[in-house]
């Protein structure tokens, strides 16, 4: 039950996180005009990964896309790449985790397979979250550098240099959305990895080997099997981790890497 809850919660947290990463990537407010200690302007500038916008006091907002690839700073391209990789990995992770959910039955999928998929999706969520956090942090670092390096009458924009009165930029809402979303995706991924441990067989499941003693038959088995006597009707060896739902004759189990997580 706890495993199902952990897995389900991990999935939901990751889902929210990835939605947040997508939202942050699409948002225009990655950097916003710094209003502190600046002359009061009747225009408010803000920039995203894909376009820059200007909101006027009139109520009119004008946004212009960055229609060049080569003219954009390498750092901006790197941030874009990190965010897109994060989204793609997160999306694949979500897809995998849906099939890995313990509460969803797909044919005769084994728990070990579900455990495998849960771990895979967990790792994907962790990497996705790290990509988002890294992307947002790189952009934030770029902003801080530009903020302090800016001179009195020159502004180095996303696409070049313009001789004008200094417009300084500070952290926009998208950065905070990105950090939180990346963190949530990371937490969700960790939860999925924890859930994977509970889903996996607890011990190594080798085929039982019986040794017959002179008095009565006792089956000595490694790890995951109870030693059962030869008396009575229960002559089958049953696994203890699933309450004896299936016998070793019904399903053949092999050692899995998840047993050692």
């Amino acid at each position: 039950m706890a495993v199902t809850a952990c897995q389900g919660l991990g999935f939901v947290v990751s889902l929210i996180g990835i939605a947040g990463i997508i939202a942050a990537t699409c948002m225009d407010q990655w950097s916003t005009q710094d209003l502190y200690n600046n002359p009061v302007t009747a225009v408010f500038n803000y920039q995203g990964l894909w376009r820059s916008c200007v909101r006027e006091s009139s109520g009119f907002t004008e946004c212009r896309g960055y229609f060049t690839l080569l003219g954009l700073p390498a750092m901006l391209q790197a941030v874009r790449a990190l965010m897109i990789v994060g989204i793609v990995l997160g999306a694949i992770g979500l897809l995998v985790s849906i099939f890995a959910l313990k509460c969803i039955r797909i044919g005769s999928m084994e728990d070990s397979a579900k455990a495998n998929m849960t771990l895979t999706s967990g790792i994907m969520f962790i990497v996705s979250g790290l990509c988002a956090i890294a992307g947002v942090s790189v952009f934030a670092n770029m902003l801080v550098t530009n903020f302090w390096m800016s001179t009195a009458n020159m502004y180095t924009g996303m696409g070049g240099m313009v001789q004008t009165v200094q417009t300084r930029y500070t952290f926009g809402a998208a950065l905070f959305v990105g950090w939180v979303a990346g963190g949530l995706t990371l937490i969700g991924g960790v939860m999925m990895c924890i859930a994977c441990r509970g889903l996996a067989p607890e011990e190594t499941n080798y085929k039982a080997v019986s040794y017959h003693a002179s008095g009565h038959s006792v089956a000595y088995k490694p790890g995951g099997f109870k030693a059962s006597t030869g008396f009575g009707s229960n002559t089958k060896n049953k696994k203890i981790y699933d309450g004896g739902a299936r016998t070793e004759d019904e399903v053949q189990s092999y050692p899995s890497k998840h047993d050692y997580v």
Partner: antibody
Amino acid sequence: EVQLVESGGGLVQPGGSLRLSCAASGFTFSSYGMSWVRQAPGKGLEWVATINSNGGSTYYPDSVKGRFTISRDNAKNTLYLQMNSLRAEDTAVYYCARLSYGNSFANWGQGTTVTVSS
Amino acid sequence: DIVITQSPSSLSVTLGERATLSCRSSQSLLNSGNHRNYLTWYQQKPGQAPRLLMYWASTRESGVPDRFSGSGSGTDFTLTISSLQPEDFATYYCQNTYYYPFTFGGGTKLEIK
């Protein structure tokens, strides 16, 4: 057609108060910033106040700050200018204007005259 | 505050001639975010409300004849009327619409020579 009609002007004594109104029609009032501009007799134009579309931000020049208050009622499509502690130098024709691209004053009312005199 | 200086204060031009009105700002009115200059030109005739001619320094307002053109960037701007018509004789104001307080120039009165 965009129409702006000012009212509320008149003769007032120094130190007195007056409230100007500007009734707007022909456009979505709640989507535009609005301003008041005045022109003293035989003088140039002077910006008096600006309010953004939702009324959340207001701006004034030092000459009227603390004495004049711009406000709007988007439900009534009306812009207001509350003028307190009036001085002789506030005598002018007051125009209300709709802001447009580039924060330009695209549409103007016909003006209302305010005379501050004892 | 931004100081807007218009020159000349009055200008006498013959009908059909070109008129060039100048406007200078004490600070750059160029916004780096959209590379637009926040300078506006108005025309005002006696007893009438001002009329918008140009915004963003060089964009003509709809309905304004194409004989009116605006140019300049940063701090120096020009309004040019290529061939003066009788209805063009009026007072012209330029305005800073970038910084608060929005400031108007003193105006240029265009008269028939």
